[in-house]
């Protein structure tokens, strides 16, 4: 058994080596974004990633080309919920230093939950998306 | 070397099918998202189909649906398309292509081609 | 499916000019998934530029590539005699991966 786990931790790591999580960070990205838009953020405000989305992608064009590749990329996972998780942690690893406040965090955490679900997917059991301070990006 | 080698091609009449292979070597094939892209004569490039790392996901441009169908064997480092009730409209080279991204920022895109096989399809 | 209109059809120009070849799509585009690529004749596609603006390895830095949503632009600053070719932008964001129809750079 205890081989089995270290084969499947293996596979696992090497199919999140070749996976792009871009697109689903970009995507969840946009969703926060646009909720903020309509409470009155500026929606013109800087950012430092060059695929962050435009004002004009924000209000929903090109969105879902983000979520299609998304969803494909997580499909991936689809057989091994351990390794979905993982993918869900370091989407959320990879995004935590992005996140304003404590509010946007929150709101992020909720729609990286929803994400395989939103992909027609298993969303995996108990995954803790919980970043430690000061996370640093694994991609 | 990295190198994608598309054979199967060939004259077959209208309604009639072709099985196209593309044999990949140089890189570790089950790590890529694979396409198939043709090109009629005189024409320009037109997307057919795409399949992704594990087959779990997989596209076809709607001119093609429900009668070409895409596939891998990962262990034999092999792409595959089956071509069913060919029409005239089918004349074109066949590319093979791999599809990577950029790591840091998320872009795909195809950087891997073969050199193409033709199919011809005439009475 | 998304529709990419390229422009002009033919580029009749000689070398050491400047060469600004058009792209447009029926629906907004992520600048993540707009890609040109550089066909010569009897050849398979070359990739160019990859997520609108970055070049691909070995890509000279006379080529250049910008826009975002529906408009998005190749540039190649000072022709050389290998530029002339035909060139395609492609959208892989949304199945259909589309492909524009393409523009013949020729030497006038």
């Known amino acids: 058994r205890q081989q089995w786990e270290l084969q499947g931790d293996r596979r696992c790591q090497s199919q999140l080596e070749r996976a792009n999580l871009r697109p689903c960070e970009q995507h969840l990205m946009q969703k926060i974004q646009r909720d903020e838009d309509s409470y009155g953020r500026d929606p013109y405000s800087p950012s430092q990633d060059p695929y962050s989305p435009s004002p004009y992608d924000r209000r929903g064009a090109g969105s879902s080309q983000h979520q299609e590749r998304c969803c494909n990329e997580l499909n991936e996972f689809e057989n091994n919920q351990r390794c979905m998780c993982e993918a869900l942690q370091q989407i959320m690893e990879n995004q935590s230093d992005r996140l304003q406040g404590r509010q946007q965090e929150q709101q992020f955490k909720r729609e990286l939950r929803n994400l395989p679900q939103q992909c027609g997917l298993r969303a995996p059991q108990r995954c803790d998306l919980e970043v430690e301070s000061g996370g640093r990006d694994r991609y | 070397e990295v190198q994608l080698v598309e054979s199967g091609g060939g004259l077959v009449q209208p309604g009639g099918s072709l099985r196209l292979s593309c044999a990949a070597s140089g890189f570790i094939f089950s790590d890529y998202n694979m396409n198939w892209v043709r090109q009629a004569p005189g024409k320009g490039l037109e997307w057919v189909s795409s399949i992704t790392r594990s087959s779990r996901t997989i596209y076809y441009a709607d001119s093609v649906k429900g009668r070409f169908t895409i596939s891998r064997d990962n262990a034999k480092n092999s792409l595959y398309l089956q071509m069913n009730s060919l029409r005239d409209e089918d004349t074109a080279v066949y590319y093979c292509?791999?599809?990577?991204?950029?790591?840091?920022?998320?872009?795909?895109?195809?950087?891997?081609w073969g050199k193409g096989t033709t199919v011809t399809v005439s009475s | 499916e998304i529709v990419l209109t390229q422009s002009p059809g033919t580029l009749s120009l000689s070398p050491g000019e400047r060469a600004t070849l058009s792209c447009r799509a029926s629906?907004?585009?992520?600048?993540?998934?707009l890609v040109w690529y550089q066909q010569k004749p009897g050849q398979a596609p070359r990739l160019l530029m990859y997520g609108a603006s970055t070049r691909a390895t070995g890509i000279p830095d006379r080529f250049s590539g910008s826009g975002s949503g529906t408009d998005f632009t190749l540039t190649i600053s000072r022709l050389e005699p290998e530029d002339f070719a035909v060139y395609y932008c492609q959208q892989n964001g949304n199945s259909p991966y589309t492909f524009g129809q393409g523009t013949k750079l020729e030497i006038k």
């Open positions: 292509a791999r599809e990577d991204f950029d790591v840091s920022t998320g872009p795909y895109y195809m950087d891997v």
């Open positions: 629906q907004s585009v992520s600048n993540m998934f």
